[in-house]
Amino acid sequence: KIDACKRGDVTVKPSHVILLGSTVNITCSLKPRQGCFHYSRRNKLILYKFDRRINFHHGHSLNSQVTGLPLGTTLFVCKLACINSDEIQICGAEIFVGVAPEQPQNLSCIQKGEQGTVACTWERGRDTHLYTEYTLQLSGPKNLTWQKQCKDIYCDYLDFGINLTPESPESNFTAKVTAVNSLGSSSSLPSTFTFLDIVRPLPPWDIRIKFQKASVSRCTLYWRDEGLVLLNRLRYRPSNSRLWNMVNVTKAKGRHDLLDLKPFTEYEFQISSKLHLYKGSWSDWSESLRAQTPEEEPTGMLDVWYMKRHIDYSRQQISLFWKNLSVSEARGKILHYQVTLQELTGGKAMTQNITGHTSWTTVIPRTGNWAVAVSAANSKGSSLPTRINIMNLCEAGLLAPRQVSANSEGMDNILVTWQPPRKDPSAVQEYVVEWRELHPGGDTQVPLNWLRSRPYNVSALISENIKSYICYEIRVYALSGDQGGCSSILGNSKHKAPLSGPHINAITEEKGSILISWNSIPVQEQMGCLLHYRIYWKERDSNSQPQLCEIPYRVSQNSHPINSLQPRVTYVLWMTALTAAGESSHGNEREFCLQGKAN
């Protein structure tokens, strides 16, 4: 705090508010009889800048020229030092350093809408740190002038509150902004414009869309605009897209036909307006209109696959599977799938509508030639049917693809490779790669996946519905006319050693050997494709290494004979399972003593 100046005065020249980089003159003088015991030679006047001494002088007054002050406030204090006493504060001064206004740049004016008011913006330039008064002046035809002031440190916008009208759209108006503060003044370059240059139309409103006869090909967009609008820009995109389609139209009078919309797609529409071909600016975009286009009948054909299963001597089970049409092919909400099953020689046909599923299972006689046709229907119609003749897909051994392999390819991908069949490879019309989770029971409810591959391909990357640590049964079919050949392999995308070994559930004696039966390891504990089982045995209470027997893994196998046990010796037996990554811990232990006669 600076005390009142009872003992002396401080004067400041040219002012307490100075221009950055200029010099200030500070004079400190003692009032009569305020020195050190009236001995003026002992008066030592000291000038402080904040808490740092910058000058001193013996006598009644001190004069100091100060330069290089920073922006903002600097505090100076004058003190008197007498011999054998503390310094006494005489008087203080605060000097404020600011900047003269720079020339305002990029002055631009706009009138929002035909009924709006003229408002201008500019760039102030460097902060002056001082109260700066901005005066905006607009001059027009017939010596008309308007003026508006803004008294704020950060002023860069003013609204004249006047409305330019289109009576003489080519008349010139000139705007200029002047900035003044206590350290100087500066004016912008003038900005000259016409009504058409600065009026920015209001964005269009009341946007609607109509589809004649509920057809996407007869679509009209309607909107309302201000009266003088000449040009419009339309932009539209599917709601799930980031890219806009853009259309420029002239003299649209609030309507435009759109010809390239996709059916059954939600679109976002926006419109902008302009008064003149090359003068003025576009309005803001209108509020978005969101609308869904009508359905059209599906295009494309379903990808259909099937599986045959023998039931008994006279019957077989057919399971049909198909993939959903893509959104662009479905062109609407698929209400049902129509499946037609026909015996080709007898002409007997059965049709069924399937809703909510993409599969269908039925039982048919093993005799006769059967065909199916599957199509997808929405509210406007049906897709072309996909026709398939039911055949024994693996019957032609010479068509079986050779050297099928399945290798992990990164996370959750399996690369399946094969060689063409021995029979004339050019006869192959396409390959189908099919995969499903391996379930020991051969469960037909397990989802089936497939992809089609061109006849010249000898590999396919499968990634759909592939999980880590799950074993898949993979089949490659080569199709040629009404014949098919297939080869199969097991594969996984990622594997590790199984979490547990098989559980031995029974050991039985048969003619001097034993038969071990076990329960399969639960699928979630197999951790990939099993390659082998191992059966271990050793004499009870023996420290010797166990003997083992390694059995190649086969899905359906759950028992195995061992004939190298000695009679009337008690053995301990257990099992493990192996994947390519390693061996499981061992399963349960069982004891067994063979009762048969010694050899």
């Epitope: 600076i2 005390d3 100046c5 005065d9 401080v10 008087c91 605060e94 600011g98 002056t128 109260y131």
Partner: nanobody, 119 residues
Framework: QVQLQESGGGLVQAGGSLVLSCAAS????????MSWYRQAPGKQRELVAE???????TYADSVEGRFHISRDNAKNIVDLQMNSLKPEDTAVYYC?????????????WGRGTQVTVSS
């Protein structure tokens, strides 16, 4: 913002004296600088005298030794004692207050009071 009210202007003979007074109201705390400016017809507005909150002063060369500025910080009043007035001192006298506003100064002006010095 600060509101400023000037008083004390009038008609005076050359060589005479006048005291102008300016009272600040509103958010008048922390007024850094109180000043008197004047504007004669057809001329730019010019600084006459100013006094900081600490009591330091500045005078225009043309009034040095004749005019004295003083300030009562408690009441937010600034007085300008004008002695030995000359016809060229005729002008509208404006009071100005500068307040610290962050790292900037915000200014407020009064409406002005007329001083006429006749010869």
């Amino acid at each position: 913002q600060v509101q400023l009210q000037e008083s004390g202007g009038g008609l005076v003979q050359a060589g005479g004296s006048l005291v102008l007074s300016c009272a600040a109201s509103g958010s008048a705390a922390l007024i850094f600088l109180m000043s008197w400016y004047r504007q004669a017809p057809g001329k730019q507005r010019e600084l006459v005298a100013e006094v900081s909150r600490g009591g330091s002063t500045t005078y225009a060369d043309s009034v040095e030794g004749r005019f004295h500025i003083s300030r009562d910080n408690a009441k937010n009043i600034v007085d300008l004692q004008m002695n030995s007035l000359k016809p060229e001192d005729t002008a509208v006298y404006y009071c100005k207050a500068d307040q610290n506003y962050g790292d900037s100064l915000r200014s407020s002006w009064g409406r002005g009071t007329q001083v006429t010095v006749s010869s």
